[in-house]
């Protein structure tokens, strides 16, 4: 969490951002909130990016002002206009690119004063893994598959029954480059699976951690997956 305060002539206002991560090719949110004003026309929001000359986005007098917007953000940004009045200056970034990573500044001017806060934005690719019994195998084998990751993640298997066991000798992980030549498909296979056990396939890079669990019993299997973004720190 980054909390910034204004310092010049007028009073300072509190601006808060949260470090976040964008999934390349999808839409992302750069989060920023501020002390609200009672008049929309008195609020100015400017988003800037370190190393970029033009603005990322500007919103003032109740509407977007994009005359000074940098080319790399053209047609890809929007604020939540109906939420600005309640102090939401978050920016929606469409079609996140690898090059969108960096330090952003959310700069706010209201009738109460000015304030700003920085935000670290990471970009990469992350996706939910699906674990299944691999029916191409002769013995009971699990296959964990996740369609899009970047940078290359680590894959670790764990089991509820054999807690602390190292499965690296009985698993095999491969990374296959996707057609856009950036992200990769992750496939990991675990051999010698036993019944009445829950196995977890954990995929992690510096942006996200995803886990696919599968419970294997005589009657059936049950699977579930979850994904968590790392380093979501507020400023």
């Amino acid at each position: 969490l980054i909390i910034g305060f204004g310092i010049s002539g007028r009073h300072s206002i509190t601006v808060t951002t949260v470090a976040s991560a964008g999934n390349i090719g999808e839409d992302g949110i750069l989060s920023c909130t501020f002390e609200p004003d009672i008049k929309l026309s008195d609020i100015v929001i400017q988003w800037l990016k370190e190393g970029v000359l033009g603005l990322v986005h500007e919103f003032k007098e109740g509407k977007d002002e994009l005359s000074e917007q940098d080319e790399m953000f053209r047609g890809r940004t929007a604020v939540f206009a109906d939420q600005v009045i309640v102090g939401n200056a978050s920016l929606r970034l469409k079609n996140v690119q690898l090059t969108d990573a960096g330090t952003y500044k959310c700069y706010i001017i209201t009738s109460k004063g000015k304030g700003n806060a920085n935000l670290e934005y990471k970009t990469g690719a992350f996706s939910m893994p699906e674990v299944n019994v691999d029916y191409n195998a002769s013995s009971e084998t699990l296959r964990c598959e996740a369609p899009r990751w970047f940078p290359q993640p680590t894959v670790v298997w764990a089991s509820q029954v054999d807690q602390g066991a190292n499965f690296s000798e009985v698993s095999n992980t491969s990374f296959e480059l996707n057609s856009e030549n950036v992200t990769m498909k992750v496939v990991s296979v675990l051999y010698n699976v036993t019944i009445n056990n829950t196995y977890s396939c954990m995929i992690e890079n510096d942006i996200a951690k995803a886990t696919g669990d599968i419970k294997v019993t005589e009657s059936e299997i049950k699977r579930r997956s979850h994904l968590q973004l790392l380093n979501s720190k507020a400023s």
Epitope: E130, N132, Y135, R223, R224
Partner: antibody, heavy 116, light 106 residues
Framework: EVQLVQSGAEVKKPGASVKVSCKAS????????IHWVRQAPGQGLEWIGE????????NYNQKFKGRATLTVDTSTSTAYLELSSLRSEDTAVYYC?????????WGQGTLVTVSS | DIQMTQSPSSLSASVGDRVTITCSAT?????MHWYQQKPGKAPKLWIY???KLAHGVPSRFSGSGSGTDFTLTISSLQPEDFATYYC?????????FGQGTKVEIK
């Protein structure tokens, strides 16, 4: 007594959506996954997907992913199947069932007819 | 997906006959379930975990098999056994059923 009671028959036009309900009673709703299975007239059984009522986690048959949506309302112990972009081949009896233990329980079935 | 093939698709038998239905899976699935369905009714779990009889199922029914090949046997067919039987696997997603075997009166 465990019971799964489904909503009544529906007639829909191609392209429309249908929402079938399955009200559970006689057991703790959040303790057992609910499965949805369909059976076209004179045909076999086809698994659509499953939902865990405790947290609404779902697994779908890839064939129905994007068209089928499974939800639950734990306050009324009711599971729902919504199927969108209906086509004539979706004409079937749709069943909800509770996950297998040593017994299983099924709803009575809901006939969905898709016809222009 | 794992495909399940039942044979025969239908059979005619007399009361007292021994009846065997087989189910073959395209991959090893370890355990199989069987359902009985009568016209206009929901299916009922009949045999689970390959060989365990569901609650209320008579002992003339039995199940066996492993890997890819499974069998449901009725040792002495009774009038109430005339129905359609489906094999079913829940050991690999998506869960799948056999196409069914209809047991009819000769």
């Amino acid at each position: 007594e465990v019971q799964l009671v489904q909503s009544g028959a529906e007639v829909k036009k191609p392209g429309a959506s249908v929402k079938v309900s399955c009200k559970a009673s006689g057991y703790t709703f959040t303790n057992f996954w609910i499965h949805w299975v369909r059976q076209a007239p004179g045909q076999g059984l086809e698994w659509i997907g499953e939902i865990d009522p405790s947290d609404s986690y779902t697994n779908y048959n890839q064939k129905f992913k994007g068209r089928a949506t499974l939800t639950v309302d734990t306050s009324t112990s009711t599971a729902y199947l919504e199927l969108s972009s209906l086509r004539s081949e979706d004409t079937a009896v749709y069943y909800c069932s509770r996950e297998i233990t040593t017994v299983d329980y099924w709803g009575q079935g809901t006939l969905v007819t898709v016809s222009s | 997906d794992i495909q399940m093939t039942q044979s025969p698709s239908s059979l005619s038998a007399s009361v007292g006959d021994r009846v065997t239905i087989t189910c073959s899976a395209t991959s090893s699935i370890s355990y199989m379930h069987w359902y009985q369905q009568k016209p206009g009714k929901a299916p009922k779990l009949w045999i689970y975990d390959t060989s365990k009889l569901a609650h209320g199922v008579p002992s003339r029914f039995s199940g066996s098999g492993s890997g890819t090949d499974f069998t449901l046997t009725i040792s002495s067919l009774q009038p109430e056994d005339f129905a359609t039987y489906y094999c079913h696997q829940r050991r690999s997603y998506p869960f799948t059923f056999g196409q069914g075997t209809k047991v009819e009166i000769k």
